[in-house]
């Protein structure tokens, strides 16, 4: 049994880091493998993660962490029984994938303005809380070409757009994702999408 693709890990910079790897053949990850991880700290102890299958030869493990600070570094040991298959390390702050925003809501009752709001996925005491920026994706269910991205570079988790920038009388969907420049993170997953019917009063034409 050998590791074909070494574990790569990303952290949500809160409580979970996810490591993925591939074996050289079909593997029952949960019965055959264990990933041991330990914070490099005098008084820490090793924790065991039981991996799950992620495709035939792929495995994924969700490492639980109390919290994360920038200095944290973890040692990782991948075991098959008594055999050490791979040894490595992981610094969560250097491999951050933020949590996805939640509770995306479209408020359509604000005088021809669409107000999109969502929730910051982090509690206020987490470092990322004040460092997230967002991308909002809006698309038409009827017209695949009607697809747009709005970059929200301020901290407030909301976006206002004129309803008239979208076509009237058709349904749209929106979703939002986050990233943090401070840690050069990857983008989060998209939030679940929300749907609304776009309708607004056309202004009277001037003759």
């Amino acid at each position: 049994m050998k590791v074909l693709q070494e574990p790569t890990c990303v952290s949500d910079y809160m409580s979970i880091s996810t490591c993925e790897w591939k074996m050289n053949g079909p593997t029952n990850c949960s019965t055959e493998l264990r990933l041991l991880y330990q914070l490099v700290f005098l008084l820490s102890e090793a924790h065991t993660c039981i991996p799950e299958n992620n495709g035939g030869a792929g495995c994924v493990c969700h490492l639980l962490m109390d919290d994360v600070v920038s200095a944290d570094n973890y040692t990782l040991d991948l075991w098959a029984g008594q055999q050490l298959l791979w040894k490595g390390s992981f610094k969560p702050s250097e491999h951050v994938k933020p949590r996805a925003p939640g509770n995306l809501t479209v408020h359509t009752n604000v005088s021809d303005t669409l107000l999109l709001t969502w929730s910051n996925p982090y509690p206020p005491d987490n470092y990322l809380y004040n460092h997230l920026t967002y991308a909002v994706n809006i698309w038409s269910e009827n017209d695949p070409a009607d697809f747009r991205i709005y970059n929200v570079t301020y901290l407030e988790p909301s976006l206002r757009i004129a309803a008239s920038t979208l076509k009237s009388g058709i349904s749209y969907r929106a979703r939002v994702r986050a990233w943090a420049q401070c840690y050069n993170t990857t983008w989060s997953e998209w939030s679940p999408s929300t749907k609304w019917h776009n309708s607004y009063r056309e202004p009277f034409e001037q003759h």
Epitope: L42, L43, S44, E45, A71
Partner: antibody, heavy 116, light 111 residues
Framework: EVQLLESGGGLVQPGGSLRLSCAAS????????MAWVRQAPGKGLEWVSA????????YYADSVKGRFTISRDNSKNTLYLQMNSLRAEDTAVYYC?????????WGQGTLVTVSS | QSVLTQPPSASGTPGQRVTISCSGS????????FNWYQQLPGTAPKLLIY???HRPSGVPDRFSGSKSGTSASLAISGLRSEDEADYYC???????????LGGGTKLTVLG
């Protein structure tokens, strides 16, 4: 609410022994390393000993090595410090502290006086 | 003799910004993070800053920490009379397998 309550302090003669206890509540005791820190009257803080969450890792300051023994009973949520061959310079308030990278919660301390 | 050196005293007037330093000796290992503790008169110490610059919940943002090599500093802005206390720095010394603490700095708020 995290609470740490030390007990077992008192007056002891040089060469004598004392056992300190620290009762923990308000958190999952078995998931945290613990430590003892002391403060002699009018002096600064001095780390004494620390123990990992399972008790497998144990560390001591040079000044107490071979005389003091730290231990824990996770089923009773209690930390202990067995102090033998006590000296006058061990006189101090002894604080129990929870470890999360640093000493993030402290007890109110128990006074140990070593005097003849 | 402490491995971490702090000034024995510091002072400032209300509203001022005060900085307390904590220096490791030249041979002090550069690996560990610094922590800061506040001890108000007659009370147990309280964690103020951990992992160089992180504040536990409940600690006002007037308190901030930074690290440079084997030294660290604690800054207190908008000084208040209730900040009068002893302040200690500490770090895990992996070469000694021990926790080392500075000698403490007594902060006096004048006026």
């Amino acid at each position: 609410e995290v609470q740490l309550l030390e007990s077992g302090g008192g007056l002891v003669q040089p060469g004598g022994s004392l056992r300190l206890s620290c009762a923990a509540s308000g958190f999952t005791f078995s998931r945290h390393a613990m430590a003892w820190v002391r403060q002699a009257p009018g002096k600064g803080l001095e780390w004494v000993s620390a123990i990992t969450m399972s008790g497998r890792g144990i560390y001591y300051a040079d000044s107490v090595k071979g005389r003091f023994t730290i231990s824990r009973d996770n089923s009773k949520n209690t930390l202990y410090l067995q102090m033998n061959s006590l000296r006058a310079e061990d006189t101090a308030v002894y604080y129990c502290a929870r470890v999360h990278r640093a000493f993030d919660y402290w007890g109110q301390g128990t006074l140990v006086t070593v005097s003849s | 003799q402490s491995v971490l050196t702090q000034p024995p005293s510091a002072s400032g007037t209300p509203g001022q910004r005060v900085t307390i330093s904590c220096s490791g000796s030249p041979l002090f290992p550069d690996s560990g993070s610094f922590n800061w503790y506040q001890q108000l008169p007659g009370t147990a110490p309280k964690l103020l800053i951990y992992a160089d610059s992180h504040r536990p919940s409940g600690v006002p943002d007037r308190f901030s920490g930074s690290k440079s090599g084997t030294s660290a500093s604690l800054a207190i802005s908008g000084l208040r009379s209730e900040d009068e206390a002893d302040y200690y720095c500490g770090t895990w010394d992996y070469s000694l397998s021990a926790y080392v603490l500075g000698g403490g700095t007594k902060l006096t708020v004048l006026g």
